[in-house]
């Protein structure tokens, strides 16, 4: 049976490669059955996660599933970093798994890597 | 019914590329992660790699990157992995697997695909 | 990488002993989120493997319970109390918690 608990479908040990300048939307996949939670997106700084208050957020509804977005507009360099997503729910508070944002700063990139170059050439992204 | 139905047996030259396919049913692959399992004859398991489908990326056991390449079409539902400059180390059973939600956890195995590398 | 040792390399076994299989990892499975991502898996003779257990202890639905997953950093065990003749193949323990992913050598659960 479909449990009713609020879960937070982040998938473990995710990575994204994006480009500093470009914009980004960062999901955090939500299900829950009656009464959307409360979501916050935070930041890993070590072994503490820092709430991101002052960021641009919103809700995508879809059918079986909803998604809160972290928006990135631009990315920026020092976007680099691990992130995380939890959902207040009864008074619990479910985390999902971290995930990282690489940035390619495209100032010091001698040319702009396609998208090709980034899934095959891996090491573009941190030179 | 979730399932992972891989092309069949394919018998290359040495020096070539073969490019093996994992077709899934029952789940949309871009929930999952998509692995790659590679068995020689009468051997182990061992990983090659994962993509993750909604987005492109990849993880490699370092001894095939450069190797292997992972890819994935979402609009198919499909998963590929492409092995070049072919030798016979590489013929073997190559797996897909996937794992539900990209929970890590091998969830569901493809039947395999025989890749037979000879001249 | 993580090196995943399993012990014996074969068991014989007769059909309704007790079998355990030991897997050794050369570092802690024990991830940042308090889980242990360390699974067994069941290759029969020409077919796919097929996980048995998850995060060490959890079975998977469908397999009986005669099988038992323990252990935690880096030791752990699969017992099978009652060895049936289904349960014959090859087992491989494998870890996630680190890249690259890792299975171990394998053990042949055979008949005496």
């Known amino acids: 049976k479909e449990s009713c608990d609020v879960q937070l479908y982040i998938k473990r040990q995710s990575e994204h490669s994006i480009l500093a300048g470009d914009p980004f939307e960062l999901e955090c996949p939500v299900k829950y059955c009656a009464n959307r939670p409360h979501v916050t997106w935070c930041k890993l700084n070590g072994t503490t996660c820092v709430k991101l208050e002052d960021r641009q957020t919103s809700w995508k509804e879809e059918k079986n599933i909803s998604f809160f977005i972290l928006h990135f507009e631009p990315v920026l360099p020092n976007d680099n970093g691990s992130y995380r997503c939890s959902a207040n729910f009864q008074s619990n508070l479910i985390e999902s798994h971290s995930t990282t944002l690489y940035v390619t700063d495209v100032k010091s990139a001698s040319e702009r890597p396609s998208k090709d170059e980034m899934a095959s050439r891996p090491w573009l992204l941190y030179r | 019914e979730v399932q992972l139905q891989q092309s069949g047996a394919d018998l290359v030259k040495p020096g070539a590329s073969v490019k093996l396919s994992c077709t899934a049913s029952g789940f949309n692959i871009k929930d999952t992660y998509v692995h790659w399992v590679k068995q020689r004859p009468e051997q182990g398991l061992e990983w090659i790699g994962r993509i993750d489908p909604a987005n492109g990326h990849t993880k490699f056991d370092p001894k095939f990157q450069g190797k292997a390449t992972i890819t994935a079409d979402t609009s198919s539902n499909t998963a590929n992995l492409q092995i070049s400059s072919l030798t016979s180390e590489d013929t073997a059973v190559y797996y897909c697997?996937?794992?539900?939600?990209?929970?890590?956890?091998?969830?569901?195995w493809g039947q395999g695909t025989t890749l037979t590398v000879s001249s | 990488e993580v090196v995943m040792t399993q012990t014996p390399l074969t068991l014989s076994v007769t059909i309704g002993q007790s079998a355990s299989i030991s897997c050794k990892s050369s570092?802690?499975?024990?991830?940042?989120?308090?889980?242990?991502?360390l699974n067994w898996f069941l290759q029969r003779p020409g077919q796919s493997p097929k996980r048995l257990m998850h995060l060490v202890s959890k079975l998977d639905s469908g397999v009986p319970d005669r099988f038992t997953g323990s252990g935690s950093g880096t030791d752990f065990t699969l017992k099978i109390s009652g060895v049936e003749a289904e349960d014959l193949g090859v087992y491989y323990c494998?870890?996630?918690?680190?890249?690259?992913?890792?299975f171990g050598g394998g053990t042949k659960l055979e008949t005496k």
């Open positions: 570092q802690s499975l024990l991830d940042s989120d308090g889980k242990t991502y």
């Open positions: 697997v996937s794992d539900y939600y990209g929970s890590s956890l091998l969830d569901y």
């Open positions: 494998w870890q996630g918690t680190y890249f690259p992913y890792t």
